[in-house]
Interface confidence: low
């Protein structure tokens, strides 16, 4: 089957009667008031161009309408990593709360207590804050009854918002509830919520708003309670989210419980430059977008852009462009293109472009005329076999027809000259060159097609078989669709390469394909009457997507719902039209394109591109199996159009694939179902300040080690080696905390043992912070500090002098015993009077 047809937001039209209230940018109160007045299920889809599939937030200044479900038209820009378990909620994967540490250079103060006021709401709050705070404000609505305070315990980064617990008799006497919960996370993060329970009465209202976050930017409505359902996930693309709950009296139902979690925002997908492409490593901050140009074009601007962190992450520069150069020398040419520069601009209307293509020694060049549209009177193209303007001319557009087989140089160089003097018609030139060994055939080329070969070296005897891309047919048609490299003495192809052309009419019976206007991508010529028949399996229908429709005035494309132009007319399409979709009632569809004779309109872009695919006749998406080691929640019981499946994994498992699947308009899922894979790696434990680490494995799998070492002058505090180990439940963990590198100080020298006394745990040197305790023998009392401490410094010093042991009056008669002790004490025989004696038979006086 062909690739699924992508759904685009602009095709989801508002339902009749839907209201689209505008966002009042003046004040939150006005927005809330307006939204409360307009609540109800009649609100339709958002006809915006929101690039985040899990959001339904209109851009600032657009009219506001709220979808009943999040849409998933493209892969999400950030992972949904919430996992709800019977025991509670925990974060998993890259947006788990432990990753929501303050950015470098900032501090995270403790969250305010429920009683303490948080930072101000609205513009003065600013987006420069780098701490995460969650605040609850209570708005007093002007009524006779006083509102009940909404007391909630909300944690940072991840947590729950619950409707107030109104158990007390005092609370029940108070009528009005009006609460605004404001969640604010770090810049560069958005907030994702999942409705866990929702049981509101008719009179109660819950609004979800994406907080503006910037001065002068009003919050935007994401959903109201009529559009919220249990299991539903919404994402705010800013670092603020507001939940506004209003109840005219004490709630009787179960209220609501909403899980929220910060997720990393991302840069938008950078636009692909015309005549080039872009590859992205990651859309999150730190990710790169690398641009490259098609053959024949040069990059103007930065080759690589980096996604910068910020309140709204953005690329660090403008998207580069790809420009065709007017002339130049191509050394060691292998394969490439010469393309005419865009008319006007830097080169002006008059062009003189000269290219020299030089192949390596012993090679020749084949030049294939891919696309040539020259003004007979004002343009001239000349090709010379050799590298100079004096080389022999082998093609001159003033005299020669465009060679079907292309040109082959006699030498290893070609000299191409293009002259254009204010042409009346747009100049179009694309020449494909290829160097080939002299004892081989040149590599055949087929625009809008594929070439397969028995010998990629194209030696004599090689066969090259041609096939066209969907929408194109071989010309000349039918067999042979292959050519052979013949003649070892001077290899050449035994026939010309065919061409792939978009034909006028045809029969298509594949499950998916393309219908192209004649000669696409060139403009179709006038005087056409083309009929295409599309047929799929009997029990299927045909979904037709009009990708491009840009036909001249008076030209018409008619779609018949059946076999042949006698069937019911499904649509008549004229003039430029936006993308749209049509569905046949049965397995047959007929397309007729009529373009009366008239003056042709030169250049590209006139024509049409229609994609078709067979779709089932029923009105639900196919059933999908639940994930092993995980679960999924569906927004609807039946898998009807618009149903959203949210996938989550058990602790210790991570989701592979898209976490949100949407049943699309064509009854296909927006992505393949994801899988839960056991996490077998530890999180990166990080580098250490004033030290470095060596890891046994870059990915930190179970069993791998990380060894930490400190720079000279620093000592390691903690475990030097961390090991990643597996756990039966939950994610793998490191065996220890990450150590620290503390600045080394010179140790304190042992100050010596006082006469008639001793020390505990005798050492020669004591590190900064270590203490030393002194004791006196029996019959002596300690004069001075019992304990002294080594204070860090250069040099480190003791807090005081060592104490003295003074003879005690009542012990004078015991001199003999003291003398014995002194003569046997080994500390007396050590240098400096230091000792390692550990007797503890002292008296405390």
């Amino acid at each position: 089957d062909g690739a699924p047809l992508p759904l685009k937001e602009e095709e989801i039209l508002p339902e009749p009667g839907s209201e689209t209230p505008t966002v009042a940018s003046e004040a939150l109160a006005e927005l809330l008031h307006g939204a409360l007045l307009r609540r109800g299920p009649e609100m339709g889809y958002l006809p915006g161009s929101d690039r985040d599939p899990t959001l339904a937030t209109p851009p600032a200044g657009q009219t506001l309408a709220v979808p009943s479900l999040p849409r998933a038209t493209e892969p999400g820009t950030g992972p949904l990593t919430t996992a709800v378990t019977p025991n509670g909620v925990r974060g998993a994967g890259p947006t788990a709360p432990e990753l929501l540490t303050p950015p470098p250079g900032t501090t995270a103060p403790p969250p305010p207590s429920p009683a303490s006021p948080g930072p101000p709401l609205g513009p003065e709050g600013g987006e420069e804050e780098t701490t995460t705070t969650i605040i609850t404000t209570t708005t007093v609505t002007t009524t006779v009854t006083s509102p009940v305070l909404c007391n909630n315990n909300i944690s940072e980064g991840e947590g729950y918002v619950e409707s107030p617990d109104l158990g007390s008799p005092v609370s029940r006497t108070l009528g009005l509830l009006d609460c605004t919960y404001s969640i604010h996370v770090y810049p560069g993060y958005g907030i994702e919520i999942q409705v866990q329970t929702l049981n509101l009465s008719q009179e109660e209202e819950l609004l979800v708003l994406a907080g503006g976050g910037s001065p002068g930017l009003a919050p935007r409505l994401l959903a109201n309670s009529s559009m919220l359902g249990e299991g539903q996930v919404l994402r705010s693309p800013t670092n603020r989210l507001l939940l506004h709950f209003q109840s005219p009296r004490v709630p009787r139902g179960g209220g609501f419980r909403i899980h929220y979690q910060a997720y990393l925002l991302s840069c938008g997908f950078p636009p692909r430059p015309a005549h080039g492409d872009v590859s992205v490593t990651d859309l999150h901050p730190g990710g790169t977008a690398t641009f490259h140009c098609d053959s024949g074009y040069q990059l103007q601007g930065e080759e690589t852009l980096i996604c910068l962190n910020g309140t709204r992450p953005s690329w660090n520069g403008e998207t580069p462009s790809c420009m065709a150069s007017c002339g130049g020398t191509i050394h060691n040419a292998t394969l490439g293109r010469i393309v005419s520069p865009e008319p006007g601009g830097a080169v002006g209307p008059n062009l003189t472009c000269r290219w020299v293509i030089e192949a390596a020694e012993g090679r020749r060049l084949h030049l294939h005329f891919e696309r040539v549209s020259l003004d007979e009177d004002n343009d001239r193209l000349m090709v010379r076999s050799g590298g100079s303007p004096l080389s022999p001319v082998i093609y001159d557009s003033d005299m020669d027809d465009v060679p079907e087989r292309g040109l082959i140089s006699d030498a290893q160089s070609l000299y191409v000259e293009l002259l254009s003097e204010t042409p009346a018609n747009p100049l179009l030139l694309s020449l494909r060159f290829e160097a080939f060994e002299e004892d081989r055939c040149f590599a055949p080329f087929l625009a809008h097609g594929n070439v397969t070969t028995t010998d990629p070296e194209y030696r004599p005897g090689a066969l090259a078989t041609f096939s066209c891309l969907p929408g194109y047919a071989l010309e000349p048609p039918g067999p042979p669709n292959a050519i052979e490299c013949v003649d070892p003495t001077e290899p050449h192809w035994n026939d010309t390469e065919p061409a792939c052309k978009a034909m006028c009419g045809g029969e298509l019976s594949e499950p998916a394909g393309v219908v192209l206007s004649p000669d696409w991508p060139q403009s179709y010529s006038p005087g056409q009457d083309c009929v295409w028949g599309v047929h799929v399996q009997e029990e299927k229908r045909i979904l037709l997507q009009v990708e491009i429709l840009n036909v001249r005035e008076g030209d018409m494309l008619t779609l018949f719902d059946g076999d042949g132009p006698s069937a019911r007319v499904l649509a008549q399409l004229r003039g430029p039209q936006p993308r749209r979709r049509l569905l046949s009632s049965g397995p047959d569809l007929t397309l007729q394109f009529q373009a009366p004779p008239g003056p042709p309109n030169p250049g590209l872009g006139q024509g049409f591109v229609l994609h078709f695919k067979e779709v089932p006749r029923n009105d639900t998406c196919p059933e999908l199996p639940p994930p092993e080691w995980g679960w999924r929640t569906a927004s609807h019981g039946d898998l009807i159009r618009g149903t959203v499946l949210t996938y989550q994994c058990e602790p210790g498992y991570e989701l592979l694939g898209s976490d949100i699947l949407t049943c699309q308009w064509d009854l296909s899922w927006s992505a393949a179902p994801p899988a839960c894979q056991k996490i077998m790696t530890c999180a990166d434990p990080g580098e250490i300040a004033n030290g470095h680490r060596t890891a046994s494995d870059a990915g930190f799998p179970v069993g791998s080690h990380v060894q930490y070492r400190c720079l000279p002058g620093y000592s390691l505090e903690g475990a030097a080696m961390l090991t990643c180990y597996s756990r039966d439940t939950g994610t793998p963990k490191w065996s220890d905390r990450v150590p620290k590198c503390a600045l080394k100080y010179e140790p304190c020298l042992n100050p010596g043992v006082p006469e008639n006394g001793y020390q505990t745990l005798y050492k020669h040197h004591y590190q900064a912070g270590e203490s030393l305790r002194f004791f006196c023998y029996e019959g002596f009392e300690l004069i001075g500090e019992v304990t002294i401490t080594c204070v860090p410094g250069h040099p480190s010093q003791w807090t005081s002098q060592p104490p003295l042991c003074k003879v005690a009056y009542e012990e004078l008669l015991d001199n003999r015993k003291l003398e014995v002790t002194q003569t046997t004490d080994p500390s007396r025989q050590l240098e400096g009077g230091l000792a390692g004696h550990h007797h503890h038979h002292h008296h405390h006086h």
Partner: antibody, heavy 117, light 107 residues
Framework: QVHLPQSRPELVKPGASVKISCKAS????????IHWVKQRPGQGLEWIGY????????TYNQKFKGKASLTADNPSSTAYMHLSSLTSEDSAIYFC??????????WGAGTTVTVSS | DILLTQSPAILSVSPGEGVSFSCRAS??????IHWYQQRTNGSPRLLIK???ESISGIPSRFSGSGSGTDFTLRINSLESEDIADYYC?????????FGAGTKLELK
């Protein structure tokens, strides 16, 4: 005018080797192929192989691998064929010929090699 | 190797007559056949390339035809200078091979 003068006839003993030459003039030597063809007295033609003058790349008929070795000297526009371990079977006229890779449009006059004791 | 069989081995004709030489390949070779003339004690000379393409400097009385496995060289009005051996050569696959030749004699 393209010319391919070849070296003089050779009389050699069995087991010996010989190197014959073919000097090109009148065209760009490095942009052509020089082929060598053997013709035994009263017999037909046998293709030995060719050398790409520009790159020095060679292609041989399997039958002559080990017997013939082709080289070229671009500064002097001369192609050489070295024949080794000669036997009476190698007695023949050896032609050099210019061509593309497929056919031979200009031929040398030939060099006669006689192997005799 | 592709075997080329030329027939007849010897052809006797009178001046002014037309003459045809045949060359048959052991397998299909498209149009990858070339014809050479070799006069007594002389070097071969290219007459026709790719079965039917003429060569500058070669008299127009020489022509070629055929494709696949059967090929023909024609001289539409024989002249005495045409007395020689005629060889066909294939270039469809390695190694390049020649036919055994046809000897043209005067009647």
């Amino acid at each position: 005018q393209v010319h391919l003068p070849q070296s003089r006839p050779e009389l050699v003993k069995p087991g010996a080797s010989v190197k014959i030459s073919c000097k090109a003039s009148g065209y760009g030597f490095t942009r052509s192929y020089i082929h060598w063809v053997k013709q035994r007295p009263g017999q037909g033609l046998e293709w030995i192989g060719y050398i790409s003058s520009g790159s020095g790349g060679t292609t041989y008929n399997q039958k002559f691998k080990g017997k013939a070795s082709l080289t070229a000297d671009n500064p002097s526009s001369t192609a050489y064929m070295h024949l080794s371990s000669l036997t009476s079977e190698d007695s023949a006229i050896y032609f050099c010929a210019r061509g593309g890779v497929r056919y031979f449009d200009v031929w040398g006059a030939g060099t006669t090699v006689t192997v005799s004791s | 190797d592709i075997l080329l069989t030329q027939s007849p081995a010897i052809l006797s004709v009178s001046p002014g007559e037309g003459v045809s030489f045949s060359c048959r390949a052991s397998q299909s070779i498209g149009t990858s056949i070339h014809w050479y003339q070799q006069r007594t004690n002389g070097s071969p000379r290219l007459l026709i390339k790719y079965a039917s393409e003429s060569i500058s400097g070669i008299p127009s009385r020489f022509s070629g035809s055929g494709s696949g496995t059967d090929f023909t060289l024609r001289i539409n009005s024989l002249e005495s200078e045409d007395i020689a051996d005629y060889y066909c050569q294939q270039s469809n696959s390695w190694p390049l091979t020649f036919g055994a030749g046809t000897k043209l004699e005067l009647k």
